[in-house]
């Protein structure tokens, strides 16, 4: 569904913007912020994961990286998979801008996207079957 | 290429319709590298509330429920895009901002042996 949420109030003394729209500058603040050097936690974790890059030229940013847990269980001290524990994905919402082509016109839509960031090892919830 | 400034529909489309947020709500407690969630609120930002994870322990929880310092709890960080009101306080004029958030924690084999 395209049902979204509106989180704005009526403008008072701000730049005029057409009704039902907002002005968005996509020059990113903190674009060059210092990110820590690669820590390789995805391969050192007891719930290791791999990365897949998704590419969409009509999305900004075009590149979104998704993690996938490598195992169902967790890796024990011996380097073996322990299926008494579960590797589970940790997810985070982010915003992207979607470009939509409708005939000769182009419109832009903000979207919330759920990104899988990595995995963690959890004790399983036991589902007792009646 | 995207233009530097765009006019965007006020409705934010949620592509996460098939996800159940409750599904992962207790991972922070069940993880071998458990974390606490701290509320970060900023009315000049959308979303105005972001939950920041802080690992509960330096080590990881072992099968006996004790902290094992042979393993390390480490935050999993992610850069996300948010909207920053620009100029400040304006309800419908924004700029994208990249922020680094800790989403949860994972247990890793150490590469740094601080303790002999």
């Amino acid at each position: 569904g395209s049902e979204g949420e509106t989180f704005f109030q009526k403008p008072e003394s701000c730049p005029p913007v057409p009704g039902g729209s907002m002005k968005l500058d996509i020059g990113i603040i903190n674009e060059n912020q210092r990110v820590s050097m690669s820590r390789n936690i995805e391969s050192r974790s007891t719930s290791p994961w791999d990365y897949t890059v998704t590419w969409d030229p009509n999305r900004y940013p075009s590149e979104v990286v998704q993690a996938q847990c490598r195992n169902l269980g967790c890796i024990n001290a011996q380097g073996k998979e322990d299926i008494s524990m579960n590797s589970v994905p940790i997810q985070q919402e982010t915003l992207v801008v979607r470009r939509k082509h409708q005939g000769s016109s182009v419109s832009f839509q903000l979207e919330k996207v759920l990104v899988t960031v990595g995995c963690t090892c959890v004790t399983p919830v036991i589902h007792h079957v009646q | 290429n995207f233009p530097r400034t765009v006019m965007v529909n006020l409705n934010i489309h949620n592509r996460n319709t098939n996800t159940n947020p409750k599904r992962s709500s207790d991972y922070y407690d069940r993880s071998t590298s458990p974390w606490n969630l701290h509320r970060n609120e900023d009315p000049e930002r959308y979303p105005s509330v972001i939950w920041e994870a802080k690992c509960r322990h330096l080590g990881c929880i072992n099968a006996d429920g004790n902290v094992d310092y042979h393993m390390n709890s480490v935050p999993i960080q992610q850069e996300i895009l948010v909207l920053r009101r620009e100029p400040p306080h304006c309800p419908n004029s924004f700029r994208l901002e990249k922020i680094l958030v800790s989403v949860g924690c994972t247990c890793v084999t150490p590469i740094v042996h601080h303790v002999a």
Partner: nanobody, 123 residues
Framework: QVQLVESGGGLVQPGGSLRLSCAVS????????MGWFRRPPGKEREFVAA????????KYADFVTDRFTISRDDAKSTVYLQMNSLKPEDTAVYYC????????????????WGQGTQVTVSS
């Protein structure tokens, strides 16, 4: 700009005590973990102690052997190191820093250190 201001060092006799303080400003104090490090004369900087954000979890280097206690006061954005039963080999410049990756934080990841506080243990 981040600032780490260590204080409380000095000259003390073997067996004596000192309490070091580190005031943190310019960033959120309640980082995942905070740590104390030291650089003995002519040696590399080494880890001394760490404390989790909640203060409920602490870890010490083996040479500490129950002589030191790390604590933190979030209201004052300060981390402390209580040092008892000091030995001549504890002579060093002591530094504090946050440990954003806890015990996994590498020395080479730090882009900023404070000036440190000199601790000299001598009779």
């Amino acid at each position: 700009q981040v600032q780490l201001v260590e204080s409380g060092g000095g000259l003390v006799q073997p067996g004596g005590s000192l309490r070091l303080s580190c005031a943190v400003s310019g960033r959120t104090f309640s980082s995942y973990a905070m740590g104390w490090f030291r650089r003995p004369p002519g040696k590399e900087r080494e880890f001394v102690a760490a404390i989790s954000w909640s203060g409920g979890d602490t870890k010490y280097a083996d040479f500490v052997t129950d002589r030191f206690t790390i604590s933190r006061d979030d209201a004052k954005s300060t981390v402390y190191l209580q040092m008892n039963s000091l030995k001549p080999e504890d002579t060093a410049v002591y530094y504090c820093n946050d440990m954003p990756y806890g015990l996994d934080t590498r020395m080479d990841e730090y882009e900023y250190w404070g000036q440190g506080t000199q601790v000299t243990v001598s009779s």
